[in-house]
């Protein structure tokens, strides 16, 4: 139950992220803002009127729309949190859970190529479930997550381009790949 | 005026299953977290279950994967299925509506679970 | 789970008395601290929430004070309906857990 109206939100290693809550507008009947951690079932920030905001550490904020900001994301953020709204009566006036999953940046891709036998390959090093596309002169040729090797027969002259890419970045690369008629690398 | 009215208690074997139930009244129910809390026979309190006014439970490790914590807002009633249970869940089932910080602002008469052979 | 406890566990007052319990956070919650009083056959009921604030048709006798990790509820001038026993309980994180209890008696 959880998990299946939660809302999917992507972050990125090392980045800031805000949380903001959706259809959500603070107003003098608000009186109290909790966001938790479920997986520990911890409260980590809090705003309550004419209180002094609650945060249970510095990586986090909590702005007066009720939005909450993670800084310097790291893999053990990656969890489901849960802020609840309440009016001045205890009323939970407003609840949202966030699924908030982490990946890591992809790397720019490097292409690399021989002509001995017009095999060229795409790699991408860094990155969380990255996909990788190759193009040849702007044609879809290969998908593929982290090398693509591919070997090229229509003509020795052509600009390949290779994409990296996953839910919180995208990353490419082209390279104009001429191979003389008998050639050696 | 609020009223919370508990159901479903009784003596039960050890290993054995017990429904309770809350039936919830005088407030817009689907509105508001609950919880059911447990009165040892020492006069201990323990909080047992917690669910929020849009179905997110939270259960302590004494009877998480035993205990399911569920609501009905349409029948404005509240149900705790209990299982595998132990002597140690001997006690007194009160629910309770809480307000925004686990105050237990208004509480039921109570459902009396005894788990003996 | 944030231990509570209270003290004392008994005790005994005269009716006029202004009485003092005491509770005990193991770690620090703020003013997140709320008080009960269960009187003999019944349920719970709330007296006062974060620590300080009253509760509407709590007599005015009852008040509570403190922060962090140490809190008091205070009966001003105890009278005899009074008797029962007075639970504290953390309402900073989950499980929300609460004291041992106070046992107030009338001499």
């Known amino acids: 139950k959880e998990i299946t109206n939660a809302l999917e939100t992507w972050g990125a290693l090392g980045q800031d992220i805000n949380l903001d809550i959706p259809s959500f507008q603070m107003s003098d009947d608000i009186d109290d803002i909790k966001w938790e951690k479920t997986s520990d079932k911890k409260k980590i920030a809090q705003f309550r009127k004419e209180k002094e905001t609650f945060k249970e550490k510095d990586t986090y904020k909590l702005f007066k729309n009720g939005t909450l900001k993670i800084k310097h994301l790291k893999t053990d953020d990656q969890d489901i949190y849960k802020v609840s709204i309440y009016d001045t009566k205890g009323k939970n006036v407003l609840e949202k859970i966030f699924d908030l999953k982490i990946q890591e940046r992809v790397s720019k891709p490097k292409i690399s190529w021989t002509c001995i036998n017009t095999t060229l390959t795409c790699e991408v090093m860094n990155g969380t479930d990255p996909e990788l596309n190759l193009y040849q002169d702007g044609k879809h040729l290969k998908l593929s997550q982290r090398v693509i090797t591919h070997k090229w027969t229509t003509s020795l002259s052509a600009k390949f381009k290779c994409t990296a890419g996953n839910k919180v970045s995208k990353e490419s690369s082209v390279e104009p790949v001429s191979c003389p008629e008998k050639g050696l690398d | 005026e609020v009223q919370l009215v508990e159901s479903g208690g009784g003596l039960v074997m050890p290993g054995g299953s017990l429904k309770l139930s809350c039936a919830a009244s005088g407030f817009a129910f689907s509105s508001y977290d609950m919880s059911w809390v447990r009165q040892t026979p020492e006069k201990r309190l323990e909080w047992v279950a917690y669910?929020?006014?849009?179905?997110?439970?939270y259960y302590p490790d004494t009877v998480k994967g035993r205990f399911t914590l569920s609501r009905d807002n349409a029948k404005n009633t509240l149900y705790l299925q209990m299982s595998s249970l132990k002597s140690e869940d001997t006690a007194m089932y009160y629910c309770?509506?809480?307000?925004?910080?686990?105050?237990?602002?208004?509480w039921g008469q109570g459902t009396l679970v005894t788990v003996s052979a | 789970d944030i231990v509570m406890t209270q003290s004392p566990a008994t005790l005994s007052v005269t009716p006029g008395d202004r009485v003092f319990l005491s509770c005990r956070a193991s770690?620090?919650?703020?003013?997140?601290l709320h008080w009960y009083q269960q009187k003999s056959h019944e349920s719970p009921r709330l007296l006062i929430k974060y620590a300080s604030q009253s509760i509407s048709g709590i007599p005015s006798r009852f008040s509570g004070s403190g922060s962090g990790s140490d809190f008091t509820l205070s009966i001003n001038s105890v009278e005899p309906e009074d008797v029962g026993v007075y639970f504290c309980?953390?309402?900073?994180?989950?499980?929300?857990?609460f004291g041992g209890g106070t046992k107030l008696e009338i001499k």
């Open positions: 770690q620090s919650i703020s003013d997140f």
């Open positions: 309770a509506r809480q307000g925004a910080n686990w105050e237990l602002v208004y």
């Open positions: 309980q953390n309402g900073h994180n989950f499980p929300p857990t």
């Open positions: 669910i929020s006014g849009g179905g997110f439970t």
